[in-house]
Interface confidence: low
């Protein structure tokens, strides 16, 4: 049997566990009307703030201040286990890793904990193996190590070559920088860049509302307001209108299904992306514009930004032809809802494109390799890679760019059996419409 | 039927590097850990280290200074290097996968490789 | 590291015979958590690389004759053959498999007497 692989972030609690929170319980209110793109305006900036907060709040809580650890033996949550532990063979019980032993970071469902990372001589410990987290080495002081060669600690230069000065010294991760005197080069015949390094001490919260984050952030809502009375005058809208429907205009819109996606977890992220999405000149030429409505766009304002932009995609050669828009069957969220799917892919695309995949959807090298390391076993590599592009992106992490990566690798046939099969696991469906105004 | 095959130089001098290669046929590669046991003539068995598919690699303290073990995907391989050896490296090389789900004992073995170092 | 010590080092018995060799940690092997101990057992016969034959301690291998059992628990364990046959002459290893680096016993050679 082959171990499982990890599922999910540590911060987000693996799957989504929401409970009726109290957003969620909100009811709509009767009020003043005001118009729309102005209430969504401000949404978006207040959902920055407290994205930002949020952020912060979690990552800087100490270790005392974080949820109190589980017990040796819990059940496990939706078949899954919290960090720390690991799932029993008959998947009822959830068993503690083995302190300095080994650990798992992400609620999961493996049968056995990963082991603990050993630091290589030449290297000292930063941070013992927790349960929940694997040991961090550094290199001695006085060595580094190098992308290229990730496995040993080289030892930093002492000293500059003749008419080099030095203008960074040896560190864990680089060697000392030289520089040319006269021009300025660094030693490898770069132009050194001004690097503006910010440090924060690891004891030290942020200020979770500096002056700075303020002023952009009534900036941006500022500029955001000016675009988005511009962008619902301007024929982008009328063309978006269709998918978009009520937004701008004060009546016409269906406010209840507005208010029931603010009521789902999530949805004012989307909402949000809509809106950024939509004011993205620079990804919409005009003649891309050309899209015709479909004849009733439900649930269409629960498209994640990746999913819109494809409703400003060129017009294919047989229109026909074209794929139609996916989305969440029971109207979730659609990167969490992917992510559910994330399990059956290895089997369905071949092995050889998962690294060229996963650069297409933007992961880097070093990315690749650490969800390499992470995966417990062969299948689940491209799991833990696809986990890591969620993560990464977030909710521009859509069905649709993943779809399109593959087109673009050449993998149709991979492309294929994945539509077919988020179609028939019943998590996905075509949006409801015409054939023709079906989108990309 | 899952078979080891492991192959490499058997006669070694003193300093010299012992690379052997382990390759896995007819079974699934990921999944398990890989490694590598060594048994010098008449005495115990000694856990060298492992590996897994993505390169992730465990090694034995008394050892992992002179000790390399990569992997090879494409070719279902597995490789040991041993650097600088002496006399007390001469012993049986095994390859073996580690259980299923990754525990730490070994449910299949190569047929050993004996090594001899010698001036 | 965990030292693995087995006791004897050969033993010989008759045909039919009970054989027991015993299996002794430098430190516990039971893991409280999921109550299992993580050892091993294996035979190895000349010229041939080790057989696995029981693991958590108790768990016959598939395949591995039911004469062949495992008992025990934190620090001490023993593999018996309820009855010595012919193709039992072998070496027998525990091992630990509760932390690295992995280590075995020094083996109990099992003759016929």
């Known amino acids: 049997m082959e171990q499982r692989g990890q599922n999910a972030p540590a911060a987000s609690g693996a799957r989504k566990r929401h409970g009726p929170g109290p957003r969620e319980a909100r009811g709509a209110r009767p009020g003043p009307r005001v118009p729309k793109t102005l209430v969504l305006v401000v949404a978006a900036v207040l959902l920055l703030v407290s994205a930002e907060s949020a952020l912060i709040t979690q990552q800087d809580l100490a270790p005392q201040q974080r949820a109190a650890p589980q017990q040796k033996r819990s059940s496990p949550s939706e078949g899954l286990c919290p960090p720390g532990h690991h799932i029993s063979e008959d998947g009822r019980d959830c068993i503690s890793c083995k302190y300095g032993q080994d650990y798992s970071t992400h609620w999961n469902d493996l049968l056995f904990c990963l082991r603990c990372t050993r630091c290589d001589s030449g290297e000292v410990e930063l941070s013992p193996c927790t349960t929940t987290r694997n040991t961090v080495c550094q290199c001695e002081e006085g060595t580094f190590r190098e992308e290229d060669s990730p496995e040993m600690c080289r030892k930093c230069r002492t000293g500059c070559p003749r008419g080099m000065v030095k203008v960074g010294d040896c560190t864990p991760w680089s060697d000392i920088e030289c520089v040319h005197k006269e021009s300025g080069t660094k030693h490898s015949g770069e132009v050194p860049a001004v690097e503006e390094t910010v440090t924060s001490s690891p004891g030290t919260p942020a200020s979770p509302c500096s002056l700075s984050g303020i002023i952009i952030g009534v900036t941006v809502a500022a500029v955001v307001l000016i675009v988005a009375v511009f962008v619902c005058k301007s024929l982008l809208w009328k063309k978006v209108l269709p998918y978009l429907k009520g937004i701008c205009s004060g009546g016409g819109g269906d406010p209840e299904r507005v208010d029931r996606s603010s009521q789902r977890p999530g949805a004012e992220d989307n909402v949000l992306n809509e809106i950024v999405s939509i004011l993205q000149p620079t990804q919409v030429p005009e003649q891309e514009m050309e899209v015709q409505e479909p004849a009733e766009p439900t649930g269409v304002n629960m498209l994640s930004p990746g999913e819109s932009e494809h409703l400003l995609e060129p017009a294919e050669a047989e229109r026909s032809q074209r794929r139609r828009l996916l989305v969440p069957a029971n109207e979730g969220d659609p990167t969490e809802t992917l992510r559910q799917c994330f399990d059956d892919f290895a089997d369905l695309v071949p092995f050889d494109s998962w690294e060229p995949l996963m650069r297409k959807l933007g992961l880097m090298d070093n990315e690749i390799k650490v969800a390499k390391a992470e995966a417990a076993g062969h299948r689940d590599t491209l799991y833990t890679m696809l986990i890591k592009w969620v993560n990464k992106t977030g909710r521009d992490a859509s069905v649709h760019t993943l779809l399109d990566a593959l087109e673009t690798l050449g993998e149709r046939l991979a492309k294929q059996k994945i539509e077919d099969h988020l179609l028939s696991s019943g998590k996905f469906m075509y949006l409801e419409g015409n054939a023709d105004s079906a989108m990309s | 039927q899952v078979q080891l095959q492991q192959w490499g130089a058997r006669l070694l001098k003193p300093s010299e590097t012992l690379s052997l290669t382990c390759a896995v046929y007819g079974g699934s590669f990921s999944g398990y850990y890989w490694s590598w046991i060594r048994q010098p003539p008449g005495k115990g068995l000694e856990w060298i280290g492992e590996i897994n598919h993505s390169g992730s690699t465990n090694y034995n303290p008394s050892l992992k200074s002179r000790v390399t073990i990569s992997v090879d995907t494409s070719k279902n391989q597995f490789s040991l290097k041993l650097r600088s050896v002496t006399a007390a490296d001469t012993a049986v090389y095994y390859c073996?996968?580690?259980?299923?789900?990754?525990?730490?004992?070994?449910?299949?073995w190569g047929r050993g490789t004996l090594v001899t170092v010698s001036s | 590291d965990i030292v693995m010590t087995q006791s004897p080092d050969s033993l010989a018995v008759s045909l039919g015979e009970r054989a027991t060799i015993n299996c002794k940690s430098s430190q516990s092997v039971l893991h409280s958590s999921n109550n299992k101990n993580y050892l091993v057992w294996y035979q190895q016969k000349p010229g041939q690389p080790p057989k696995l034959l029981i693991y958590w301690a108790s768990t016959r291998e598939s395949g591995v004759p039911d004469r062949f059992s495992g008992s025990g628990s934190g620090t001490d364990f023993t593999l018996t053959i309820s009855s010595l046959q012919a193709e039992d002459v072998a070496v027998y290893y525990c091992?630990?498999?509760?932390?690295?680096?992995?280590?075995f016993g020094g083996g109990t050679k099992v003759e016929i007497k």
């Open positions: 091992q630990q498999y509760y932390s690295t680096p992995l280590t």
């Open positions: 073996a996968r580690g259980g299923s789900s990754g525990y730490w004992y070994f449910d299949l």
